[in-house]
C-alpha cells in the first residue's frame, strides 16, 4: 500500500508530516526523501511533542488503524554490522539525515542485543490511551521490514522537512479562505508557520462567487533570516466587519476609522513591520538574530546589535553565525593536527607517541623494546618504524613480514641439494641414502654399500621425532638415486623429514592435528616426491597460496 499525507505541523524551521500506510522503513524513508525530507528525528523532548502533535492530528482523521498498539517509523536506524552500544543514549543507532549522537532518548524497553541485522526505530502509540504531552510516544526497535512485509503493527511513518525559515500565516481581515501549498507537496489551510517557498492562495468572500477575489503570494526571504509574503495590510478586509473580524487580521492592535476602514498598530516597545500587520520588538536582540552559539549584544542606545562568538569560534560572512576557527592552520603540532569544534588536538603518526620537548611533540616508539617486539627473531628499530630479520636458514614470512619460516633446502629453487635423500631441519638440512647405499664423505653423494633392507640412512634422530614426525621410505622405492647439483651442504645438519627426489610415486601425508599454540607451523610426515612436488602450507579458505620469498636482510614490518 502507498502512503497518504494526513497531517502536517510546522514549527521553528521544520515541518513534520504524518502518514498512514504499511510500508517498510526503507520505503517510508524513500517516500519522505522524494519530497526533500527524511524520516523524522526526535532529538529533544520539544521535538517529541511536535511529532506527537502531528500524530494526534493524523489519528483524529484516521478511523481504520488496525492495531491497538500502532507503530510509526522515525529516522533512527542502526546499520547492518553496527552493534548495539549500551554506553550511548542512542545505543549505537543514528539519525538517517546525519547529525550528532543526541542525548535525548525514550526507549520502550531494553533493546535486543544484535549486530548482524539492520535495526529500525518506530514510535509506539497505544491507541486506547489519549495522547498527552506528559506521555510521549516510546521508541521501539525492531527489524526494518521489507516490501510487502513492513513488520508487526507498523501503521505509518513521520517525515521531517527542514527550511531556512518560515513566514507567519497570512492574516485575513474579513471572510475568506487561505490554502497553502508547501514545497513538500502538502496543502493545508491551517499552519501556524508556513515554510519558505510555500505558495498561498487567498480566496476572499463568503462563498458568493460574484464577490470572490483571489490573491496569490509566495513566502520569500526578504532579508537574511527575514521571511514574508510581500503583502501589505490585512487581506479580505470588509467595511461590514471592521476590526470585529479576526481583529482585522492585525497582530496586536486594530484601530477603526469612522468610515469602516481600519489600521493595525502595536503596543509600546514594538514597531509595525512593512506588511502593516505584524509587530516586532524594538529591541533588535529580541528576535534572536544570532545563530550557532553566537550571543546578541545590543549597540549604543539599543538601536542596533552585534553577534559575539565563544572562544575557538568566529563570525561567518553573514556576521550572524559562528563558525569554528581552524587552529591547525597555524601548525601548532609537531606531526598531525586535528581540528575540533572550538579547539584542536595534536596526534602522532603511526610509529610515534606523544612526548619530547614542547607542546604537541612526538617521539619514536621503540617497537623492538623488551617484551614489545613484533618480530619472531631479529628486530631493528628505525625512526617511526622497525624491520624484522631472520637467522640463517630462515626467511621472513607472514602477512606483515614479522614471522620467520624455515627454508626447505630440499625443495630449493636449484633442485635437490643431495644426490638421493634430503632431510630438512629447522634452519638447515642434511643428506641421506636409500637402503643399500651409504653417504659419501662429501655429505652429498651416495655410494654402493652393503645390501640392507633397513630404513634409509640418516633417519630423523630421536630429538627431532617429537617435533616433525618421520616415517621410513617405502621399501618399493629402490630406484637408483638421481644426481643432484654438485656442491657441499652449507653445514653439518641434523636430520628431519626426508624428501626423496626420484621417480617414486608422490604420497600425500596425513595432517597431524595439534593442540593450538601461539605460532603453529605446518606439520607433515615425510613424503617421497619429485623435485617439483613441494608440499607446504596450504592456502587458507579464500586466501592466497602464493608466498613472496624474502631475503634474509630484513624488510620493513607493517604497523
Amino acid at each position: 500500500t502507498g502512503a497518504d499525507t494526513e497531517a502536517v505541523v510546522c514549527v521553528g524551521t521544520a515541518c513534520y508530516t504524518a502518514h498512514s500506510g504499511k510500508l517498510s522503513a526503507a520505503e517510508a524513508q524513500n517516500h519522505c526523501n522524494q519530497n526533500g525530507g527524511n524520516l523524522a528525528t526526535v532529538k529533544s523532548k520539544e521535538e517529541a511533542q511536535h511529532v506527537q502533535r502531528v500524530l494526534a492530528q493524523l489519528l483524529r482523521r484516521e478511523a481504520a488503524l488496525t492495531a491497538r498498539m500502532s507503530k510509526f517509523w522515525i529516522g533512527l536506524q542502526r546499520e547492518k554490522g553496527k552493534c548495539l552500544d549500551p554506553s550511548l543514549p542512542l545505543k549505537g543507532f543514528s539519525w538517517v539525515g546525519g547529525g550528532e549522537d543526541t542525548p535525548y532518548s525514550n526507549w520502550h524497553k531494553e533493546l535486543r542485543n544484535s549486530c548482524i541485522s539492520k535495526r529500525c526505530v518506530s514510535l509506539l502509540l497505544d491507541l486506547s490511551q489519549p495522547l498527552l504531552p506528559s506521555r510521549l510516544p516510546k521508541w521501539s526497535e525492531g527489524p526494518c521490514g521489507s516490501p510487502g512485509s513492513p513488520g508487526s503493527n507498523i501503521e505509518g511513518f513521520v517525515c521531517k522537512f527542514s527550511f531556512k525559515g518560515m513566514c507567519r500565516p497570512l492574516a485575513l481581515g474579513g471572510p475568506g479562505q487561505v490554502t497553502y501549498t508547501t514545497p513538500f507537496q502538502t496543502t493545508s489551510s491551517s499552519l501556524e508557520a508556513v515554510p519558505f517557498a510555500s505558495a498561498a492562495n487567498v480566496a476572499c468572500g463568503e462563498g458568493d462567487k460574484d464577490e470572490t477575489q483571489s490573491h496569490y503570494f509566495l513566502c520569500k526571504e526578504k532579508a537574511p533570516d527575514v521571511f514574508d509574503w510581500g503583502s501589505s495590510g490585512p487581506l479580505c478586509v470588509s467595511p461590514k466587519y471592521g476590526c470585529n473580524f479576526n481583529n482585522g487580521g492585525c497582530h496586536q492592535d486594530c484601530f477603526e476609522g469612522g468610515d469602516g476602514s481600519f489600521l493595525c498598530g502595536c503596543r509600546p516597545g514594538f514597531r509595525l513591520l512593512d506588511d502593516l500587520v505584524t509587530c516586532a520588538s524594538r529591541n533588535p536582540c529580541s528576535s534572536s538574530p544570532c545563530r550557532g552559539g553566537a550571543t546578541c549584544v545590543l549597540g549604543p542606545h539599543g538601536k542596533n546589535y552585534t553577534c559575539r562568538c565563544p572562544q575557538g569560534y568566529q563570525l561567518d560572512s553573514s556576521q550572524l553565525d559562528c563558525v569554528d576557527v581552524d587552529e591547525c592552520q597555524d601548525s601548532p603540532c609537531a606531526q598531525e593536527c586535528v581540528n575540533t569544534p572550538g579547539g584542536f588536538r595534536c596526534e602522532c603518526w603511526v610509529g610515534y607517541e606523544p612526548g619530547g620537548p614542547g607542546e604537541g611533540a612526538c617521539q619514536d616508539v621503540d617497537e623492538c623494546a623488551l617484551g614489545r617486539s613484533p618480530c619472531a627473531q631479529g628486530c631493528t628499530n628505525t625512526d617511526g618504524s622497525f624491520h624484522c630479520s631472520c637467522e640463517e636458514g630462515y626467511v621472513l614470512a607472514g602477512e606483515d613480514g614479522t614471522q620467520c619460516q624455515d627454508v626447505d633446502e630440499c625443495v630449493g629453487p636449484g633442485g635437490p641439494l643431495c644426490d638421493s635423500l634430503c632431510f630438512n631441519t629447522q634452519g638447515s638440512f642434511h643428506c641421506g641414502c636409500l637402503p643399500g647405499w651409504v653417504l659419501a664423505p662429501n655429505g652429498v653423494s651416495c655410494t654402493m654399500g652393503p645390501v640392507s633392507l633397513g630404513p634409509p640412512s640418516g633417519p630423523p634422530d630421536e630429538e627431532d621425532k617429537g617435533e616433525k614426525e618421520g616415517s621410513t621410505v617405502p621399501r618399493a622405492a629402490t630406484a637408483s638415486p638421481t644426481r643432484g647439483p654438485e656442491g657441499t651442504p652449507k653445514a653439518t645438519p641434523t636430520t628431519s623429514r626426508p624428501s626423496l627426489s626420484s621417480d617414486a610415486p608422490i604420497t600425500s601425508a596425513p595432517l597431524k592435528m595439534l593442540a593450538p599454540s601461539g605460532s603453529p607451523g605446518v606439520w607433515r610426515e615425510p613424503s617421497i616426491h619429485h623435485a617439483t612436488a613441494a608440499s607446504g602450507p596450504q592456502e587458507p579458505a579464500g586466501g592466497d597460496s602464493s608466498v613472496a620469498t624474502q631475503n634474509n636482510d630484513g624488510t620493513d614490518g607493517q604497523k
Epitope: 547492518k80 554490522g81 552493534c83 548495539l84 552500544d85 549500551p86 554506553s87 535486543r112 542485543n113 544484535s114 549486530c115 548482524i116 541485522s117 539492520k118 527489524p143
Partner: antibody
C-alpha cells in the same frame, strides 16, 4: 543456563560438503545471534560467519569465498553451518558461539567443538 | 581486515611470576571491541576479559587487561599452574571478526 550442543565428528572427502549443527538451550533462541569459528593448527582461530535467528540475516567472512552457508531453524532452536568444496586445509575443529547478554562481540558461550577431517 | 599480532608466541614463567601478554592491531580498534580468551588443552575457548578490561564471569582477579588504539595487554599478576593455556585476543571493527595467533603460557 545457556548450552550449545554440537553434532559429532565427521570425516569427509575433498570436494564434498559438511553440515555441522548446534542446538541451543537455556535461552530464547531468537534472542542471540549465533556465530561459527573454526580452529586449525596453521591458521588458529578464524571467524567464519554468523546469523541473526530472528530475521535470518547473515554475515560471512569473505575469505571463505562463498563456501560457507549458515542457517537457523527456529522450531528446533538449532543453527547449522555448511562448508562446501572441502579441501584438506578445512580439517579443523568447528565451534558455534554467541555473546549472550554481553556486548561488542565478546563471545561468552561456546559449543564443545566438532572435529571435521578432510581426507581422501 | 584488521590483523592482530600477539607476542610473545610462548611465555615460560615460574609460578607466582607476573605474565604480560601483548596484542597489537594493524589499525586502531575501539577498546569496547577488544576481548581476550583462554583455551586450555583439548577444551573450547573461554571468554576471559571483555571490552579490554572487564573480567568475564568466574574469572579470578589475578587476570587484568588494559590498552587502547592498537596496543592491548593481558596481565596475570601471579601465575598459577592452572593458568597454563593458550591466550587469544579478538577484535571487531567491521566484518570479519579476527583473532590473534595466540600466546602459549607454560610453567618453567
Amino acid at each position: 543456563q545457556v548450552q550449545l550442543q554440537q553434532s559429532g565428528a565427521e570425516v569427509k572427502k575433498p570436494g564434498s560438503s559438511v553440515k555441522v549443527s548446534c542446538k541451543a538451550s537455556g535461552y530464547t533462541f531468537t534472542d542471540y545471534e549465533m556465530h561459527w569459528v573454526r580452529q586449525t593448527p596453521v591458521y588458529g582461530l578464524e571467524w567464519m560467519g554468523g546469523i541473526d535467528p530472528e530475521t535470518g540475516d547473515t554475515a560471512y567472512n569473505q575469505n571463505f569465498k562463498g563456501r560457507v552457508t549458515i542457517t537457523a531453524d527456529k522450531s528446533t532452536s538449532t543453527a547449522y553451518m555448511e562448508l562446501s568444496s572441502l579441501r584438506s586445509e578445512d580439517t579443523a575443529v568447528y565451534y558455534c558461539t554467541n555473546y549472550g547478554n554481553l556486548y561488542y562481540y565478546a563471545m561468552d558461550y561456546w559449543g564443545q567443538g566438532t572435529t571435521v577431517t578432510v581426507s581422501s | 581486515e584488521i590483523v592482530l599480532t600477539q607476542s610473545p608466541a610462548t611465555l615460560s614463567l615460574s609460578p607466582g611470576e607476573r605474565a604480560t601478554l601483548s596484542c597489537r592491531a594493524s589499525s586502531s580498534v575501539s577498546s569496547s571491541y577488544l576481548h581476550w580468551y583462554q583455551q586450555k588443552s583439548g577444551a573450547s575457548p573461554r571468554l576471559l576479559i571483555y571490552s579490554t578490561s572487564n573480567l568475564a564471569f568466574g574469572i579470578p582477579a589475578r587476570f587484568s587487561g588494559s590498552g587502547s588504539g592498537t596496543d592491548y595487554t593481558l596481565t596475570i599478576s601471579s601465575l598459577e599452574a592452572e593458568d597454563v593455556a593458550v591466550y587469544y585476543c579478538q577484535q571487531y571493527s567491521g566484518y570479519p571478526l579476527t583473532f590473534g595467533g595466540g600466546t602459549k603460557v607454560e610453567i618453567k
